[in-house]
Amino acid sequence: MAVTACQGLGFVVSLIGIAGIIAATCMDQWSTQDLYNNPVTAVFNYQGLWRSCVRESSGFTECRGYFTLLGLPAMLQAVRALMIVGIVLGAIGLLVSIFALKCIRIGSMEDSAKANMTLTSGIMFIVSGLCAIAGVSVFANMLVTNFWMSTANMYTGMGGMVQTVQTRYTFGAALFVGWVAGGLTLIGGVMMCIACRGLAPEETNYKAVSYHASGHSVAYKPGGFKASTGFGSNTKNKKIYDGGARTEDEVQSYPSKHDYV
């Protein structure tokens, strides 16, 4: 039950995380105009991975796509790549994890196969989350560097008469969405990996066997013994946590008329 819950929760958390990564990647507000020096600007600039936008006080918003590929900064290209890799890995991970869910039965899929698929999806989610976090962090670092560079030459005076204010950019909402989403995907992946350990068919119970002593015959029922191998007649791999509990297909040995103590 705990394994199913962990796996299910891991799946849901990862799903939310990947949805967040997709949202962050599509969002236009990766960097927004810093309003510290001009809080009452009538023109507000913000930029995303795919286009830059200008929102005017009038209510008009104009967005222009980055129609060049070669003219874009290498860092921006790297961030795009990291986010796309994160989305692709996350999407594949989601697809794999759907089939790996313990609550979903697909044919006669072995628990070992589900465990492997859970582990695979977990690793994919972890890598996906790391890609998103890395992408967002690279962009944030780029912003910080540019921010201080533009602060250093904030005002370029023309004969000391005219001020040309350079637009500075700060962290946009997409960065925070990306960080949180990447973190959630990472957590979901870890949960899937933990669930995989619980799913792995490494704990098989021996069937109850009657041991007849030479003197007084007593039936010994070794309830909670575990086998370290995957072999044995109990193919259903049902776990026995309670020593006295029996699996459905367990053969019970009834005492014979000579077995009274």
Epitope: S52, S58, T164, T167
Partner: antibody, heavy 118, light 113 residues
């Protein structure tokens, strides 16, 4: 056709109050930022106040801050300017304007005259 | 606040003449985000509200005759009327639309000789 009609102007004593209204029609009122611009006799236009389409952003000229209040009622397609503690220098023709591309005042009303005099 | 300085304050012209008026801002009106200059030109005739002529420094408002041309970038802007007509006699104002408060120039009055 875009139409802006101002009303509520008149003669008021210094220190008095007045509420101007601007009825808008012919466009999606809730989609545009609106402003009040005034023009004193034989002077150039002076921007007074601005309100964004959703009333999220509101700005005033330093000369009227604390005395004037701009508001809008999108359901009624109406813009308001509540003026208090009026001074003689507030005497002007008050125009209601709809913002357009480039934050320009694309459409203007015919104006309402406000006279502050003892 | 951005200060807008217009020159000359008045112009006396003859019909058909080419007219140029200047507007200077104390700060650049060029927005780096879209490379547009947030400067607007208005025409005001006596007893009427101002009328929008040009926005983004050079984009003509629909319905405005093509004899009106706006140019310039950053801090220096010009309004040119290629061939002045009698109906063009008015006061022309430039306005900063880049940063609040929106500020107007003192105007250039166009008069007939």
């Amino acid at each position: 056709e875009v139409k802006l009609v101002e009303s509520g102007g008149g003669l008021v004593q210094p220190g008095g109050s007045l509420k101007l209204s601007c009825a808008a029609s012919g466009f999606g009122f809730s989609d545009y930022g609106m402003a009040w611009v005034r023009q004193a006799p034989r002077k150039g236009p002076e921007w007074v106040a601005f309100i964004s389409n959703s009333a999220y952003s509101i700005y005033y000229a330093d000369t009227v801050t604390g005395r004037f209040t701009i508001s809008r009622e999108n359901a009624k397609n109406t813009l308001y300017l509540e003026m208090s503690s009026l001074r003689s220098e507030d005497t002007a023709m008050y125009y209601c304007a709809r913002l357009g591309y480039g934050n320009s005042f694309a459409y203007w009303g015919q104006g309402t005259l406000v006279t502050v005099s003892a | 606040d951005i200060v807008m300085t217009q020159s000359p304050s008045s112009l006396t012209v003859t019909a058909g003449e080419k007219v140029t008026m200047s507007c200077k801002s104390s700060q650049s009106l060029l927005n780096s985000g879209n490379q547009k200059n947030y400067l607007t030109w208005y025409q005001q005739k006596p007893g009427q509200p101002p009328k929008l002529l040009i926005y983004w420094a050079s984009t003509r408002e629909s319905g405005v005759p093509d004899r009106f041309t706006g140019s310039g970038s950053g801090t220096d802007f010009t309004l040119t009327i290629s061939s002045v007509q009698a109906e063009d006699l008015a006061v022309y104002y430039c306005q900063n639309d880049y940063s609040l408060p929106f500020t107007f120039g003192a105007g250039t009055k166009l008069e007939l000789k």
